[in-house]
Each structure stands twice: as C-alpha cells, then as structure tokens.
Amino acid sequence: CEAPPTFEAMELIGKPKPYYRVGERVDYKCKKGYFYIPPLATHTICDRNHTWLPVSDEGCYREMCPHIRDPLNGEAILANGSYEFGAELHFICNEGYYLIGKDILYCELKDTVAIWSGKPPLCEKILCTPPPKIKNGKHTFSEVEVFEYLDAVTYSCDPAPGPDPFSLIGESMIYCGNNSTWSHAAPECKVVKCRFPVVENGKQISGFGKKFYYKATVMFECDKGYYLNGSDKIVCESNSTWDPPVPKCLKVSTSPTTKSPTSSASGPRPTYKPPVSNYPGYPKPDEGILNNLDD
C-alpha cells in the first residue's frame, strides 16, 4: 500500500513510510485540540488488494470551551452552534441595557485546552443624567436625578415678558436612549417673529394672522396681469426670516422679445411672456376669480 490517508482531526503515530506490506497496520491518534471518544477504530490495515481498510477521524472531537450562561438582562448566542474551539460567542443585551466588556468571545486553544478569549461581559441598565436646562424654558421631572432607558421629558417655554411669546425650536419631547444619551439636543426657547410679508401687486390668500411666529405659513396670489416670481408659500423660520423669501409679483408683458423670469408655478422657462389668460395659474378673461379678495 502507498502512504495511509490523512485526516483533519487525527494524525499518524510514527513516521509515514512510502510503502507498506499487505497486513501491515498503522495507528492514528487525535491531533492537538481534539480528544478521542470510543468506539470508532483509530487504526487501519493494508489490505490484500493494496488499499487501506476504511478508517475515519469521526472519533476525534474538538476540544470544547466551558459553557457560558446568558448574562443577566442579556443573551449569549453561539455563532456556529457549538462550544468547540474556533467557536464565536456573541453577547447582546436586552433593550434598556448596555454591554460592559467585549461583545464577542472566541474559543481558543491554549496548549491542549480550549478556553474563552476573555471574561464574559455584563449587561448594565441604561441610565441618563438629567437633560440640559434651557434658557426661558423648563422640562418635566426637573427634580429627578437619574433617568432610565426610554424615560421622557417634555420641554415648554416660559411666558415671555414682552408682547411676543417664546417659541420652542426643536424637539419638545426627548427620551433617554442608547449610549445613555438623550434622543435629541435640548430645544431652544426664543422669540421668533417674522416681519409682515408685503407683496406689491399681490395679496395674501391664507395664513392670516396678527403676528407671524415660528412655523407660521402664508400663501400668496398675484393680481390680474401679474405673475409670481418665487414661491407662493413661505414659512417663518427660527431665525425670524421667511423661507423661501417673500415672493414678488411681476407684470406680465405681452412683448415677444422679453424673457419671463422663472416662476415657482411654471415648468421650463418660456421664451416670451404669454398673455395673462394663458399664463399658468391665471383664469380665462371671463373668469373673475381674482377680482374679489375674500370671495
């Protein structure tokens, strides 16, 4: 027989020879990191037809790391289903808890013993320090010193000393989240007031108000014979300015030589200004919808 078969889990005892006589026996032993569990044979014999009798390494089992229990308030998950060396053990914590330590341990071979690559981690409760205090405002549970996971606080603004109220800019409700951090930055309380939006040759059609505070929304329409240059809808933003800016109403010119400025309502820029009745958003001459302001 030629050289005996080689295996992943067991090795030949002694040096291999190039040829073996019929009837000659070779013995195997489990490799380092493996251990033998009977009854499977670990030897073979050179048969009369010059082949080796069947033998396998299935009696050699990988060394195993000790079993690790799930951490308190968490879970240990075997990546490949066994504790044999080479295994990975992944740790996750239940919602509301965070991991202290390594989230993966590896089953490694030290000499002939399989051991884990480190200590199992712990799952600690997620806690947050109190959220920031804000100027001109306050939050609920201001007396609480430690917040647990998903505990929420709601911010509100103080009454303003002047005629205009404070607006709350940002998220009014924030909660204690992962990494022991709050879900959002603390909001801001400040007076946000946009100027009265004046549009020459046009008028406001919605969003009427005494004053225009944060997030106030106004819509416009141009007089007959004028078209809107800009957006028909504007919003009062946190820096007390309108966004987009207050639009303009420009005169519709019937001259075929002049180009029309872009309008928020139009598609591609036309090469001339069409008559009013054909301009996007304008009525036909017999439709008097723009003649009355609040009809």
Epitope: K193, C194, R195, F196, V198, V199, E200, N201, K203, Q204, F208, K210, K211, N292, L293, D294, D295
Partner: antibody, heavy 118, light 107 residues
Amino acid sequence: EVQLVESGGGLVQPGGSLRLSCAASGGSVSSYDISWIRQSPSRGLEWLGVIWTDGGTNYNSAFMSRFTISRDDSKNTAYLQMNSLKTEDTAVYYCERVYDGYPWFAYWGQGTLVTVSS
Amino acid sequence: AIQLTQSPSSLSASVGDRVTITCRALQGISNYLNWYQQKPGKAPKLLIYYTSSLHSGVPSRFSGSGSGTEFTLTISSLQPDDFATYYCQQYIKLPWTFGQGTKVEIK
C-alpha cells in the same frame, strides 16, 4: 423711545420740488421701517410709501412717479423727495415708524405742512 | 386700491354713551384692519390693530370687532378725552388705505 421730527415743509409753486426730512432721535433711523403719510382736508389720510430697514421701498402707485423715499444713515434721517408738485399735494406730511415690521402706524412725527400754490 | 367707507361721518354723543363706528371694505380684508384716533392739530394715534387688539396704553373702553368686509369700533362709555376723529386703515394690500374718518362731537 425714538422720536421722529419732520422738517422741510413750506410754500412751493406748482411744478416745483421739495425734500422733506424725518430726523430720528433716541434711536437709529436704519433700525426702523419708516412710512410717509399725508393728510389734507380734501383727501383725508393717504399712505405714500415706506422704506424698510433693509433699504427696500414700497410706494403708493398713485405717487410713485413723483415721490421718492430714501435714507441717510450717517445723518440718521429719512427723506421724502417730491417732484412736479400740484396744488392737490397741499397737506400735512407725517413720517411714521412702522410698528416692529407690521403696518400699524404707532409712532408718528408731529407733521410738517406743505403748501403748493402760485 | 381697497376703499374703506366709514359710517357715520360724524356723530354727537354725551359722556357715558356707548358709541359704535362702522368701517366697510369693498373687498375682503380678513382681520387686517387698524383704528386710529386723531385730535385737532395732532398726529393720529393707534388705538387698535388687527381688528381687535388694543395697542399698549389704550383704555379698555375701546374695543374692535369684525372680519372680512365689516368692522366696528366701540367705545363702551364715552369719556371727555374721547371726542376726536376716528379712522380705520387696511393693510392686506398695497397701497395701505384709510377710511375718510368719523368725527365724534359733544352733544
């Protein structure tokens, strides 16, 4: 509190020009939106135009071709330039500080009389 | 321009009377209407803005109401200091315009 004082009124012939001044004391004219309003027995109160803090202007289209509003921040003064004056322009002219960016006329000057007559 | 018409043009009343002045707009102006008081030889003074909001320092006997095209200024109990001319003013659309005025005289 800002005080507005108009000056420059007087007698002027039809077709003539006049420049009215509105001086601000106790505050910067550039910090306020300034409107010009006139009043006559025959025509009542008429809003002429406004100059906003950013220097932009809006006019009553009835006067746009003849009247111009401007501002000189170094002199802390707003102006109303009136050209091609007519007898019907005879009135008391007021400058007025617009209330906090809103068209509410809360802070008026004492007014200056302009008489257009030959 | 949006035309404002005040009624009556003048009225006579006594101290303690309840006085109502009306301002009508030819087009709807939402609540964008102000009221002013003017005494002879003086500049007008803002009384009420945005239909019903009292300007600072204005006595509470003055009140405003209305919406759209019809507005009223009410003086609940006329005082000697209230004999003056009253004007309404719209600001929904340029040019901003005034009513012709209502003169309140002593009866």
